[in-house]
Amino acid sequence: APVPPGEDSKDVAAPHRQPLTSSERIDKQIRYILDGISALRKETCNKSNMCESSKEALAENNLNLPKMAEKDGCFQSGFNEETCLVKIITGLLEFEVYLEYLQNRFESSEEQARAVQMSTKVLIQFLQKKAKNLDAITTPDPTTNASLLTKLQAQNQWLQDMTTHLILRSFKEFLQSSLRALRQM
């Protein structure tokens, strides 16, 4: 697994560099997770033809993956910092169950899958410190998450492969939109 942000060789070699600001740390954390997702996507795409499949809709019906929309206030038009931050944190919390599902889905990248999951937890903590309106953030129900996880794990092999591909793709897209939005804050 790659070295977490702030622990790369450049940081070690440059002890006099200015410490990262909160925004820079968040930005770096997201890019670190995105790099992890890229590695996981490589394994998924090499292992199956899911990345080229046109049957994504079949599996997407089972999923309720968080998506960014105009109303969330994260796009340049209608940008709203507080609404957007709530959407990002809520979305990340909703993704956690899907990241848990990914944990047993990789052979050569098992460590990488764990790193993505743990780094996302750290990112949520960073963002919660930044949010003023924590009351507006709804935490997913653990019971609902547990039954969703059971349902996903009970799918046939093809659907499980497709689900893995869709989770990684959607999480990547959500993080990229979040990255762009957070840079406007």
Epitope: R31, L34, M68, E70, F75, Q76, Q176, S177, L179, R180
Partner: antibody
């Protein structure tokens, strides 16, 4: 062959409108960040707008915000730039281009450009 | 918009010279900066991205450095083909360019 071909440029009066098209081939716009850049005659490059493939999120330079709209038609693999309330200072060669990777870091593919002249 | 200020606007130099072009961002952009070379009537060509990564196929005499708000492009030994206009571009948010540096023969 991977390429971008712009069209739709021409002469237009101040206050008028024009729609530029950028047809992509050899790759799909639905999984790439796209960008419009312009260059006034004898001047430097100016970023105009970009469109993030996910959710079609657009971002505009202050100089064109509220007047220009970037959009796409995935079925035609084409990106558009709708330009309204045109001004003399919008006269330029308009390039359609592609950001190179997932965290846009550089432009790796450019069209040949289409000339827009705003004059009465 | 993030403003990119490039200097100098014109630079006169001779073949074999070492030249440096500077680019300053109006706010921190981490390492999200690219350098391009443009020749008359042509589209720009990327030389350096992420502040210091040399694009494949670009001669090693080109190098980039910097982070945050201050960046430099250095050509260690000018070649005849290097006389052109150079631009920096940030990709932190949007994609604004510097105003360009015209490198001309002294």
């Amino acid at each position: 062959e991977v390429q971008l071909v712009e069209s739709g440029g021409g002469l237009v009066q101040p206050g008028g409108s024009l729609r530029l098209s950028c047809a992509a081939s050899g790759f799909t716009i639905s999984s790439n960040y796209m960008i419009w850049v312009r260059q006034a005659p004898g001047k430097g490059l100016e970023w105009v707008s970009d469109l993030y493939y996910y959710a079609g999120d657009t971002y505009y330079a202050d100089s064109v915000k509220g007047r220009f709209t970037m959009s796409r038609d995935i079925s035609k693999n084409t990106v558009y730039l709708q330009m309204n309330s045109l001004r003399a200072e919008d006269t330029a060669v308009y390039y359609c281009a592609r950001w190179a990777d997932d965290h846009p870091a550089w432009v790796d593919l450019w069209g040949r450009g289409t000339l827009v002249t705003v004059s009465s | 918009d993030i403003q990119m200020t490039q200097s100098p606007s014109t630079l006169s130099a001779s073949v074999g010279d070492r030249v440096t072009i500077t680019c300053r961002a109006s706010q921190g952009i981490s390492s999200w900066l690219a350098w391009y070379q443009q020749k008359p009537g042509k589209a720009p060509k990327v030389l350096i991205y992420k502040a210091s990564t040399l694009e494949s196929g670009v001669p090693s005499r080109f190098s980039g450095s910097g982070s945050g708000t201050e960046f430099t492009l250095t050509i260690s030994s000018l070649q005849p083909d290097d006389f052109a206009t150079y631009y920096c571009q940030q990709s932190w948010l949007g994609g604004s360019f510097g105003q360009g540096t015209k490198l001309e023969i002294k």
